[in-house]
Structures are given as structure tokens and as C-alpha cells.
């Protein structure tokens, strides 16, 4: 009888099925929807989380101006195809043979086409801008306290290396968190900024992906930080390819 059998759950992903039937009675966890093995010592990839979600029962200006190439996830949820390592496949198609290309965070980066559409490579999202508006408070938060708290959150809760949190901007009531991670910077074992941003997004919405942990309780010097709006912009290493028709619509 092992410790694994007493607590066979996945701390970092509640959307898993776990059983103590791994080698030596170890706990083995697989993602809902895909059945893929999940490493419970780190964040699960966004692709596997989206797939699990779709399989589950239906329930002086200091702020950054997003570049003209920034993408926002307007398409919402879809059931993605993930590769054997749990990353998004570059080309995604729906049940009606409509296909499109996505970036490494699964956001569409081309016009939709048919089965002949080619997506040569999975383009990396290297810069993520998380734009938050907090609920009214008695006064503004202290910028350096806010900065420190958000950096601590990404380091401790999401296990994202501090060097990937590029900046925290604040202009009451807007907070912007910039995450940057080039292909060359990401070492084996590093949490991906796309995965960290997705966990954060779900936490902010009160839909924590962590097993058995309470929801996110963000406080700055004891003062609750309550978010009322979230927008996330994704910047890819190669700009997206949309037709002019979409850009002028």
C-alpha cells in the first residue's frame, strides 16, 4: 500500500482520470478526452485542457498598445487536435471539413479554408499581453506591491520562471501583464507562457484547473484584487495571415 494509492489525484489538473496502476503502484493520470498521460508536477498543456473541456459534460501613457498583429481569441471553444506531446497541431479542422491554422496557444491565425489548406509549421506565440480591469477600490493599488504580487503568483502558482514575466503595467483600473518567451529561451521543463496564461485566465474566471485548491484569492497588501474584465492578446513570432476582407470588416 503506497502513498500514491492514498492520494491518487493530479494536483495540477482536475480534468484527469487517475488510478494507482502505474509501475510499483504509482499514480498514473490521463487527461479526459484524449486519454494522454499527464505530468502532475507541472501545468498541463492548453491543447489537452481544451480537449478535456470539450469532452466534459456541458456546464504618460504607460499601458501597452497591442500591435496590429496581435490576435484575440474570438473563436471561443473548439475540440482541438493535439500532437503526441500535447501541443496544438498547426492545422485544425471541424466536423464539416472547415480548416484553419493556429498558433502555439491554439488561436486561429489564418482565414478559414477547406481540407486543402496547408499549415506548414506551428507558429510560436512568443508574447502574451494580459489586459485586466479591476473592480473599483478605495484607492489605487501601489504599483510595486501589485507588480510583486503578480510576479509571485506566476512563479508560485503557475511555476513560470520569473524571467518570462517581462513587465507589469498599471494605470488604474487597468493592469497589464506581459509574458515573453522566445523559442530559444524555453528550456526543457520550462512552463510555456501560453499554458500559464490559460491557467491564469481560468483562475480569474473562477474556473480553477487545480485539484482541490481553493479558487484564486488575489490580494495586494491584504486588499482584494477583483477582476471584472479580462482581454488577452497573443503575438506570434511570424505575423498572422488574414485577408484584407477580414481586416476591414
Amino acid at each position: 500500500h503506497t502513498a500514491a494509492q492514498d492520494n491518487c489525484t493530479c494536483p495540477t489538473n482536475k480534468m484527469t482520470v487517475c488510478s494507482p496502476d502505474g509501475p510499483g503502484g504509482r499514480c498514473q493520470c490521463r487527461a479526459l478526452g484524449s486519454g494522454m498521460a499527464v505530468d502532475c508536477s507541472t501545468l498541463t498543456s492548453k491543447c489537452l485542457l481544451l480537449k478535456a473541456r470539450m469532452s466534459a459534460p456541458k456546464n504618460a501613457r504607460t499601458l501597452v498598445r497591442p500591435s496590429e498583429h496581435a490576435l484575440v481569441d474570438n473563436d471561443g471553444l473548439y475540440d482541438p487536435d493535439c500532437d503526441p506531446e500535447g501541443r496544438f497541431k498547426a492545422r485544425q479542422c471541424n466536423q464539416t471539413s472547415v480548416c484553419w491554422c493556429v498558433n502555439s496557444v491554439g488561436v486561429r491565425r489564418t482565414d478559414k479554408g477547406d481540407l486543402s489548406l496547408r499549415c506548414d509549421e506551428l507558429v510560436r506565440t512568443h508574447h502574451i499581453l494580459i489586459d485586466l480591469r479591476h473592480r473599483p477600490t478605495a484607492g489605487a493599488f501601489n504599483h510595486s506591491d501589485l507588480d510583486a504580487e503578480l510576479r509571485r503568483l506566476f512563479r508560485e502558482r503557475y511555476r513560470l520562471h520569473p524571467k518570462f514575466v517581462a513587465a507589469v503595467h498599471y494605470e488604474q483600473p487597468t493592469i497589464q501583464i506581459e509574458l515573453r518567451q522566445n523559442t530559444s529561451q524555453k528550456a526543457a521543463g520550462d512552463v510555456d507562457i501560453g499554458d500559464a496564461a490559460y491557467y491564469f485566465e481560468r483562475d480569474i474566471k473562477g474556473e480553477s484547473l487545480f485539484q482541490g485548491r481553493g479558487g484564486l484569492d488575489l490580494r495586494v497588501r491584504g486588499e482584494p484584487l477583483q477582476v471584472e474584465r479580462t482581454l488577452i492578446y497573443y503575438l506570434d513570432e511570424i505575423p498572422p495571415k488574414f485577408s484584407m476582407k477580414r481586416l476591414t470588416a
Epitope: 503506497t2 502505474g22 509501475p23 504509482r26 499514480c27 498514473q28 493520470c29 499527464v38 505530468d39
Partner: nanobody
Framework: QVQLQESGGGMVQVGGSLRLSCAAS????????MSWVRQAPGKGPEWVSY????????YYPDSVKGRFTISRDNAKNTLYLQMNSLKPEDTAVYRC??????????????WGQGTQVTVSS
Amino acid sequence: QVQLQESGGGMVQVGGSLRLSCAASGFPFSSADMSWVRQAPGKGPEWVSYINADGSKTYYPDSVKGRFTISRDNAKNTLYLQMNSLKPEDTAVYRCARAKLTDTHYVEDYWGQGTQVTVSS
């Protein structure tokens, strides 16, 4: 880039034997734990053997214990699975996988494309 390439699969009669090989590259094989995982049609993946980095520790589920033997040659970056007394229920695609074992959890993080093993009666 991690690459795992299996070979040695095929069709065999009940009671027969096969030896699978897996050539590994793109990572320090001699310091990696490894597993063989199989997936039968319409079923989920199932690990069938595990070996630690230096080959001193192996594990098998009850379904294959005494029939399957996992081994490795770190000088050749190759993993092996010797399968004896094969049964129809051993029919599946067999993949080698890089694995990780902690005090409480087991996970595979990279897999090969797999080789088909068919046991006919």
C-alpha cells in the same frame, strides 16, 4: 528533438515470441527511465513494462508479468522488449516511451510512432 523509433513487430501465433527494439535519439538516453506502452483498438494506452535509467529496476503489470522482459543497451541507445507466450489479448500497437517515476506518480512524456503486434489463434 526527441526521437523514438520502434521495430520488430509483426504477426505471430498464440504461444509465440517477438522481440521489439526502440532506437532513441535527441536526449541523454542513459539517464532516462523508459517504458513500453501498448494500445489495443478501441482501448486506452496501457504501460506494459518500465525500466530505470541504469537498468537495475524493472516493473510489469500482472497482465504480462513472467512473459515480458524489458532491457536496455545504453551504449547503443536502444530499448528492448522480449515478449514470450503471446496471447490474442496482447494484440496492440506497441510504443516505447520516455518515462518519469516520482515517489507518488508515473508519467510518460515522449512516445514513438509504434509497431503493430498481432497475435492470431
